[in-house]
């Protein structure tokens, strides 16, 4: 999987969208690693 900063941000955006935003506030691109996906 792509692990560049931009890929990580887009993946997290998709995850947040699918979860309806019901995710911990600190679940943000700069402090989640690729393993979080």
């Amino acid at each position: 999987a792509c692990d560049t900063a931009t890929c990580v941000t887009h993946r997290l955006a998709g995850l947040l969208s699918r979860s309806g935003g019901v995710v911990k506030n600190n679940f943000v691109p700069t402090n989640v690693g690729s393993k979080a996906f």
Partner: antibody, heavy 119, light 107 residues
């Protein structure tokens, strides 16, 4: 309102260094990566590097061979790009850019900073 | 580094025309491609991410497609305000790389 506001135009002599700032507002600065991109006259956009403001880790375009340094001041929500050993080919518009999810899912760019390298 | 080759480098079309710009990557970049619009003297503006997804606020006449090495930006009905240079970018690998740009003019 999300804004990335960059420092003003610079004129530098060959061999000098330049440091461009990018002040972020309207979002949590440490939550999102900050990229630096430049555009020389008549040339394609060129990615220089990215910083994670949360842990200050950086990734650079190896084309710049150690001439570029990206830093942040978290307390001032400001990112900096320093380019050293300037040459005429470094004459370009330099942009900071950050892809955000909140408050809006969008790729925001600063207004650009013109750096002219001339003897 | 991944080379992004855009074509054409410039084109002229009439208001209402369907316009297609292509971008070819030198190796597989999945769908990790973005498209930007840049008007003279302005910063690039994001249009498309992940090859085919429009950012909020981008008019529906703009669409993107493709995967692997071949990507397309289409403007379904050209408007006067679409006069700009369009750039593709791959972000699958570091360093991110851009196409050389396509300058779009109105006939």
């Amino acid at each position: 309102e999300v804004q990335l506001v960059q420092s003003g135009a610079e004129v530098k002599k060959p061999g000098a260094s330049v440091k461009v700032s990018c002040k972020a507002s309207g979002y949590t600065f440490t939550d999102y990566y900050m990229n630096w991109v430049r555009q020389a006259p008549g040339q394609r956009l060129e990615w220089m590097g990215v910083i994670n403001p949360y842990n200050v880790r950086t990734t650079y375009n190896r084309k710049f061979k150690g001439r570029v340094t990206i830093t942040v001041d978290k307390s001032a929500s400001t990112a900096y790009m320093e380019l050293s050993s300037l040459r005429s080919e470094d004459t370009a518009v330099y942009y900071c850019a950050s892809l955000l999810i909140r408050p809006h899912y969008f790729d925001y760019w600063g207004q650009g900073t013109t750096v002219t390298v001339s003897s | 580094d991944i080379q992004m080759t855009q074509s054409p480098s410039s084109l002229s079309a009439s208001v209402g025309d369907r316009v297609t710009i292509t971008c070819k990557a030198s190796q597989n970049v999945g769908t990790n491609v973005a498209w930007y619009q840049q008007k003279p003297g302005k910063s690039p503006k994001a249009l498309i991410y992940s090859a085919s997804y429009r950012y909020s606020g981008v008019p529906s006449r703009f669409s993107g497609s493709g995967s692997g090495t071949d990507f397309t930006l289409t403007i379904s009905s050209l408007q006067p305000e679409d006069v700009a240079t369009y750039h593709c970018q791959q972000y699958n690998f570091y360093p991110y790389t851009f196409g050389q740009g396509t300058k779009l003019e109105i006939k």
